[in-house]
């Protein structure tokens, strides 16, 4: 295979490589395919040491349109020469290729999180996997955004060590009986477009004074 030749290239596939729950997930979408494939096979090799294309075991004859490559793509420095083959039964419909360099191509999906509202603070529980590969840390920082009445405040908690295990952050000095919304995301060291989580909102319970004022009425 000549990796500089566009023989394999097919503009009818759109690829996306994402860090989802600290796992490298390659997903794809097809454009202008009259026949929808019944299954796919993903193959790759490393650009710096081109060998025969290797089939990704858990993505051979898969019906899914994504592939977990965490255990295959271990380096953020290598370029991975990737070929996606689409089949209908035994017939090969197409093959698309693309080279991926994780250090620059990766997008970062927000972690899962829960919020619990108290009178004047919110506990934000961010869920990280228990173990995260060192290569997949990516100089990321966690950002928690607090929104209320059109005002957005950014919190950048300092996480000791790497992002693994569950992490709790307290947004304090809040106003009772007020609606607050929270979003979390992972920010890269550069201006890469961030993917913010959907907002989770909570109406804080009223404080003591307003309760006593209510009962005095």
């Amino acid at each position: 295979i000549s990796y500089d030749s566009p023989d394999y290239t097919d503009e009818s596939c759109t690829f996306k490589i994402s860090l989802r729950n600290f796992r490298s997930i390659l997903s794809w979408e097809l454009k202008n395919h009259s026949i929808v494939p019944t299954h796919y096979t993903l193959l790759y090799t490393i650009m710096s040491k081109p060998e025969d294309l290797k089939v990704v075991k858990n993505c051979a004859n898969t019906t899914r349109s994504f592939c977990d490559l965490t255990d295959e793509w271990r380096s953020t420095h290598e370029a991975y020469v990737t070929v996606l083959e689409g089949f209908s039964g035994n017939t090969t419909l197409f093959s698309c290729s693309h080279n991926f360099w994780l250090a620059i191509d990766m997008s970062f999906e927000p972690p899962e999180f829960e919020i619990v509202g108290f009178t004047n603070h919110i506990n934000v529980m961010v869920k990280f996997p228990s173990i995260v590969e060192e290569e997949l840390q990516f100089d990321l920082s966690l950002v928690i955004e607090e929104q209320s009445e059109g005002i957005v405040k950014k919190h950048k908690p300092e996480i000791k060590g790497n992002m693994s295990g569950n992490f709790t952050y307290i947004i304090d000095k809040l106003i009772p009986n007020t609606n607050y919304c929270v979003s979390v995301y992972l920010e890269h060291s550069d201006e890469q477009a961030v993917i913010k989580s959907p907002l989770k909102c909570t109406l804080l319970p009223p404080g003591q004074e307003s309760e006593s004022a209510e009962s005095a009425k």
């Epitope: 990796y3 500089d4 030749s5 566009p6 290239t9 690829f15 650009m47 710096s48 271990r74 380096s75 953020t76 420095h77 290598e78 370029a79 290729s97 693309h98 080279n99 360099w101 250090a103 620059i104 191509d105 990766m106 997008s107 060192e134 290569e135 060291s189 550069d190 201006e191 890469q192 477009a193």
Partner: antibody
Framework: QVQLQQSGPELVRPGVSVKISCKGS????????MHWVKQSHAKSLEWIGV????????RYNQKFKGKATMTVDKSSSTAYMELARLTSEDSAIYYC??????????WGQGTSVTVSS | DIQMTQTPLTLSVTIGQPASISCKSS???????????LNWLLQRPGQSPKRLIY???KLDSGVPDRFTGSGSGTDFTLKISRVEAEDLGVYYC?????????FGGGTKLEIK
Amino acid sequence: QVQLQQSGPELVRPGVSVKISCKGSGYTFTDYAMHWVKQSHAKSLEWIGVISTYYSNTRYNQKFKGKATMTVDKSSSTAYMELARLTSEDSAIYYCVRSGGSNMDYWGQGTSVTVSS
Amino acid sequence: DIQMTQTPLTLSVTIGQPASISCKSSQSLLDSDGKTYLNWLLQRPGQSPKRLIYLVSKLDSGVPDRFTGSGSGTDFTLKISRVEAEDLGVYYCWQGTHFPWTFGGGTKLEIK
């Protein structure tokens, strides 16, 4: 064969901006990232940053943040770098360089930028 | 940022004689993936730089085997077994292990 064709020399006044281009040919443009490197007498070679030609993600050398802006036009297989608020310190030759992973392999012929009043 | 220090600044060599250039980094260039992203470039007079060696010792296609790269961690060497006239120019080492990528100051090889 792989070629990176850069735009011609620029003679510009201090304080203005300049946008230089780099057209890739002989390979699949979106399969390789594009870097920009500055070469000046004072500082030899300096890495400015890199852009993903497929996703347009960028990574800048902190020193050039606010000075350089990298963009890409996939349809014409062209990478661009704009340099803002030019001073005499920005007078240099600027190269675009292709890379697959952490290996810059092919270099453009360079674009000379001279800042002079 | 990682500092890359090259020595000597200038190297004056007779054709047919060996040459050696040293490159030292301020931090180890060994990555967690087990590879070392140390590379060498040659810039001939009036030309753009051209990649010679990548990953410490791998020769780019078309580079004669009189060039060898070696080293590990923070200390690296480029050797030319027998210098030829076409080898003159400025040699640069650069590292791609840590962002921002950084270059050595260059070593000018001139023919005696």
